[in-house]
Amino acid sequence: MTSGSVFFYILIFGKYFSHGGGQDVKCSLGYFPCGNITKCLPQLLHCNGVDDCGNQADEDNCGDNNGWSLQFDKYFASYYKMTSQYPFEAETPECLVGSVPVQCLCQGLELDCDETNLRAVPSVSSNVTAMSLQWNLIRKLPPDCFKNYHDLQKLYLQNNKITSISIYAFRGLNSLTKLYLSHNRITFLKPGVFEDLHRLEWLIIEDNHLSRISPPTFYGLNSLILLVLMNNVLTRLPDKPLCQHMPRLHWLDLEGNHIHNLRNLTFISCSNLTVLVMRKNKINHLNENTFAPLQKLDELDLGSNKIENLPPLIFKDLKELSQLNLSYNPIQKIQANQFDYLVKLKSLSLEGIEISNIQQRMFRPLMNLSHIYFKKFQYCGYAPHVRSCKPNTDGISSLENLLASIIQRVFVWVVSAVTCFGNIFVICMRPYIRSENKLYAMSIISLCCADCLMGIYLFVIGGFDLKFRGEYNKHAQLWMESTHCQLVGSLAILSTEVSVLLLTFLTLEKYICIVYPFRCVRPGKCRTITVLILIWITGFIVAFIPLSNKEFFKNYYGTNGVCFPLHSEDTESIGAQIYSVAIFLGINLAAFIIIVFSYGSMFYSVHQSAITATEIRNQVKKEMILAKRFFFIVFTDALCWIPIFVVKFLSLLQVEIPGTITSWVVIFILPINSALNPILYTLTTRPFKEMIHRFWYNYRQRKSMDSKGQKTYAPSFIWVEMWPLQEMPPELMKPDLFTYPCEMSLISQSTRLNSYS
């Protein structure tokens, strides 16, 4: 946002919220009055966009119009003019300026020569009071180019190509009050260039190439109130009194420069400074006395710098400060008494700062604080006396609930129930199935156990959501740092990784057997068990490594309320970022690619085999069934993993990802595989359907026999268990011939296709 638009915004909204009520109503800590009625509501219900009081009082005075905006009209009521195309509002429509260049517009004593391809300052009659020369081709301001314009009050020179300004360029402009030089190519201002501008109040030099300034640069600017030097390339401020020649300076905006440090003497003469904006610089060091002379300072913005340490007493002299922004600095530690002296502070921004030693003591002395901004909404619990605390959600959790969305709060139970029930059902069915392939069964049980852990993870998250219902913010920080959160997070990663690795293993086995049938070696019991154990060990290692080294991984699982490390934040340790990327874009992406490629190859291989078959129509039908089944396996994998890969990849590119994404991924996307694996790999297979069919048949038979008083015996059912979605037609179900899918290689090509339908 340009300063122009910021000022324009403040101009419109500066006085928006003016009435405060309920000062006499006393509420307990963390609660705030509903205007002049006796009702009190907790912090989290104030300024949340909902009329909870019933009289709209909880949504009044929510705008943070602290700092300069309260006094804005006094000095800058017409600032917006600088950005308008026609900056003038003359009372008389007819032109009163004598000679006017043909392409210019004129109203009263005001001249508008915007976008007229001027290469030099035009010569007009000396009674002109405002001159706009924006968007022209002026490169130089030579000596005395405005010398005759003694009545000129406003001069607009934005968006030219000015590189050079003569020391005597502005000579004679004794009445000038506003000078706009923004969006030019000025690299240096010679000391004394503004010497004649003793009535100048606003000097705007935004978006130029200024690399240095010194006190004499501003010599002569005795009346200057506003100095905007935004978006230049200043690397340092002078170690001399900057305001020496600007005794009335109120507003100094140095945003978007390259300033490295602030010196003790810089502001020694700036005793009238009310607003100091130094955001988006490279300040890495502050001296204890840097701001000591600024005893009238109302707003200090140091956001988006490189400040690591705040001297304990740096704010001790800022008794009038009402707005302080320290956001997005790599501040390592904030002293408990850091803000003790800021008795009039109303707005404090600490966004993007990890406050490891946060405590209520830090903010308790700030009795007038009405707005506070943190990196994490969980920090709001440490400032219970502040009415408006942002953020009030991280997209996952809110001040009230671990899961902010009602949909998530309901579906966490639904999804966990489906996941757990499906997987437990498959596990429990094993005793009733006389499987000819114990090794495959073992793999499937392993898969179901892993997927079941995902259901348990969601149950735990749902449980804690219930436990913290309505007051999550009180427990948020402790919950995210707790062993419970670490363990439940590692459980989710364990489930994810084991499931992914198992699916890859099962897919590769199948791939080798089908694509290279004659190379297929039947895996032995020992090999299968070894692979399964290795997969589980790998899962445990991947999941629990982050818990073993807090120094390296920081709070790896506790970056959000659902304890799932999906996307890394800027402040997360580099180790944690690399680790997270290695899992999601390393192991899991590789596994996903292998699975997609394998199923594609398998289908192609079977399709090639089918070409030689005689019963074309029958083959096509079977091929379609096969294609459909394969597609669903790959599709559910893609549905689950592609969003996760995209989120991870975007976070790697520093794209800001809304917190909301994580919770939707964790509750709806991540469990897709866990919930559908039992269905895809067991419940929809022909052997399982036949088993259910036989159970049902036996049950009906028994019922009818029982009614006739006869005793029946159910026939033993042999489930020749094949790979997922890969069932044998009845004519091929010969136990002695097919005990393992690899042995399908003995069948003719056309029979191979049959075996999939």
Epitope: T187, F188, P191, G192, D196, H198, P216
Partner: antibody, heavy 118, light 113 residues
């Protein structure tokens, strides 16, 4: 400390242009104006002109606009003044002097005595 | 151009005496910003000029406090309260209110009586 070093006496034939130099040290050369001042024997001081090393902006006394050409070399922190077609009238001591604001000259060189003679 | 007139041209004094040099300009030296840009220089024999006083009454760094400047508009004075041997030389006044060009007075020679 601030120093403005000017070379010793120069002897030049009438009509043959001459360049006088002034090497600055001890301060930021590009932040100050460099002025040139002429003093004829036993007479007062006469301001010739000034140049700003940052962008070579030159302000000349109208009286010397056809006589003097001012230049700077930022790499060597040296200011120079070329006098074209010198005559005996140009025989004088030439001083370089710096100023931050175009007001007063806080440091001066020791001067170069130019003699124009055949 | 602004003409600066100094008086006297020569000022013989005894060491320890007070000396007073006058400078008059052909037009007011009060700048539109309120400042008056009148300065004093001393050129000792065989040396280059040195700044003594700037903007009527401000002593340059290292200048002894026996030197003082005063005046306004068109009339200005430099006073030396107790003349010392090292003070001997030619004193020039100069203006920078109406520039270019900077103009100097013709000089006042301070010498031992």
């Amino acid at each position: 400390q601030v120093q403005l070093q000017q070379p010793g006496p120069e002897l030049v034939r009438p009509g043959a242009s001459v360049t006088l130099s002034c090497k600055a040290s001890g301060y930021s050369f590009t932040s100050y104006w460099m002025n040139w001042v002429k003093q004829r024997p036993g007479q007062g001081l006469e301001w010739i002109g000034m140049i700003h090393p940052s962008d070579s902006e030159t302000i000349l006394n109208q009286k010397f606009k056809d006589k003097a050409t001012l230049t700077v070399d930022k790499s060597s922190s040296t200011a120079s003044m070329q006098l074209s077609s010198p005559t005996s009238e140009d025989s004088a001591v030439y001083y370089c002097a710096r100023c931050l604001l175009p007001h007063y000259f806080d440091y001066w060189g020791q001067g170069t005595t130019l003699t124009v003679s055949s | 151009d602004v003409v600066m007139t100094q008086a006297p041209l020569s000022l013989p004094v005894s060491l320890g005496d007070q000396a007073s040099i006058s400078c008059r300009s052909s037009q007011s030296l009060v700048h539109s910003n309120g400042n008056t840009y009148l300065h004093w220089y001393l050129q000792k024999p065989g040396q280059s000029p040195k700044l003594l006083i700037y903007k009527v009454s401000n002593r340059f760094s290292g200048v002894p406090d026996r030197f003082s400047g005063s005046g306004s508009g068109t009339d200005f004075t430099l006073k030396i309260s107790r003349v010392e041997a090292e003070d001997l030389g030619v004193y020039f006044c100069s203006q920078s209110t109406h520039v270019p060009p900077f103009t100097f007075g013709s000089g006042t020679k301070l010498e031992i009586k």
